[in-house]
Interface confidence: low
């Protein structure tokens, strides 16, 4: 024997109430499936969070962040407060990359600067709180008296900021 | 690497006492430091820590006045007042798993053996 | 304050089962939730952090998963050295959130 709630399409749900006929979701409620006894409830985007996508009688809301946080989590579950570049998110607020390390963008940790000279490279451009350095030729590429120099990059977990 | 509390005794209610925890192999201008106790027989709680880098505390509200936490370049210190005999308890400190203000890096992987406080008259 | 808070406080298997430990955290925390094992007379030990990330080390019988505010911690092929409490830890601390204790109460484990 069938199922006779398998014949309810998504955005229905097989009403037990009503000899197990298919009847629309109330409203704020949705079933992506067939077959469903109950409607899930909407999500509701409140506070930080703002709607990307309206709830549907087929699909739930689906939330973003407000200006100045970014999501966090499955689905977007968390709002967390950016930063600038060249910044790194501490219990204390946002705070400015140590010396000798960056973040380039307005989320995440800041992470050491790359070692040139781990690469037998030597350091073309500086590093800044924003920017990780450029590495170029190595030394002995350069002609003799071209002065090369490498950053020192601070110790710690790589992709950690260290002080 | 490795850290070690020191200065624990049996102290009478209401006198003060300062706690230390010495690093080796690291320095703590790179780490979160925390304190932490544990009374006998019951679970972890946490006093507060402080950031190496910037010298930022923060505290378990109910430790706020009370507890002060300071650093040197090689120890951080865990000051108490007004001790009662429900500070009795296991003082354990430890440091962060990674370098870094983040609060993504405030997991702890480098812990003390403890030192023990006993507050009685 | 963000409270935390563990299920069961004590909890009994044999030796080649599974037990699972459960973490709720009184408000999201996203993903930043760790695990610690303690044996007597012995200092805390990180086990997992970021929910699910094994400390070096770590067998891969330890498993974390969750996120939010639901959190889980499973322990397979339980071993006899398993035996210990086991405490969460969030450590969510963006949109000046606080918390009283960062621990949750702890789970004894028990192997038969």
């Known amino acids: 024997l069938q199922d006779p709630c398998s014949n309810c399409p998504a955005g229905t749900f097989c009403d037990n109430n009503r000899n197990q006929i298919c009847s629309p979701c109330p409203p704020n409620s949705f079933s992506s499936a067939g077959g469903q006894r109950t409607c899930d409830i909407c999500r509701q985007c409140k506070g930080v969070f703002r709607t990307r996508k309206e709830c549907s009688s087929t699909s739930n809301a689906e939330c973003d962040c407000t200006p100045g946080f970014h999501c966090l989590g499955a689905g977007c579950s968390m709002c967390e407060q950016d930063c600038k570049q060249g910044q790194e998110l501490t219990k204390k607020g946002c705070k400015d990359c140590c010396f000798g390390t960056f973040n380039d963008q307005k989320r995440g940790i800041c992470r050491p600067w790359t070692n040139c000279s781990l690469d037998g490279k030597s350091v073309l451009v500086n590093g800044t709180k924003e920017r990780d350095v450029v590495c170029g030729p190595s030394p002995t590429d350069f002609s003799p008296g071209t002065p090369s120099t490498t950053m020192p990059v601070p110790g710690g977990e790589p992709g950690h900021t260290s002080h | 690497q490795s850290v070690e509390e020191s200065g624990g005794r049996l102290v009478t209610p209401g006198t003060p006492l300062t706690l230390t925890c010495t690093a080796s192999?690291?320095?703590?201008?790179?780490?979160?430091m925390i304190w932490v106790r544990q009374a006998p027989g019951e679970g972890l709680e946490w006093i507060g820590d402080i950031y190496g880098g910037t010298a930022t505390t923060d505290y378990a509200s109910w430790a706020k006045g009370r507890f002060t936490i300071s650093k040197t370049s090689t120890t951080v210190d865990l000051k108490m007042t007004s001790l009662t005999t429900e500070d009795t308890a296991t003082y354990f400190c430890?440091?962060?798993?990674?370098?870094?203000?983040?609060?993504?890096?405030?997991?702890?992987?480098?812990w003390g053996q403890g030192t023990l406080v006993t507050v009685s008259s | 304050d963000i409270v935390m808070t563990q299920t069961p406080a004590s909890v009994e298997a044999a030796v080649g089962g599974t037990v699972t430990i459960k973490c709720q955290a009184s408000?999201?925390?996203?993903?930043?939730l760790a695990w610690y094992q303690q044996k007597p007379g012995q200092p805390p030990k990180l086990l997992i952090y970021?929910?699910?990330t094994l400390e070096s080390g770590v067998p891969s019988r330890f498993k974390g998963s969750g996120s939010g505010t639901e959190f889980t911690l499973t322990i397979s092929d339980l071993e006899s050295a398993d035996a210990a409490t086991y405490y969460c830890q969030g450590y969510d601390w963006s949109s000046s959130n606080r918390y009283d204790n960062t621990f949750g109460g702890g789970t004894e484990v028990v192997v038969k």
């Open positions: 430890a440091r962060a798993r990674y370098s870094g203000g983040s609060y993504a890096n405030y997991v702890f992987n480098l």
């Open positions: 970021r929910t699910s």
């Open positions: 192999g690291f320095t703590i201008s790179s780490y979160h």
């Open positions: 408000q999201s925390i996203s993903s930043y």
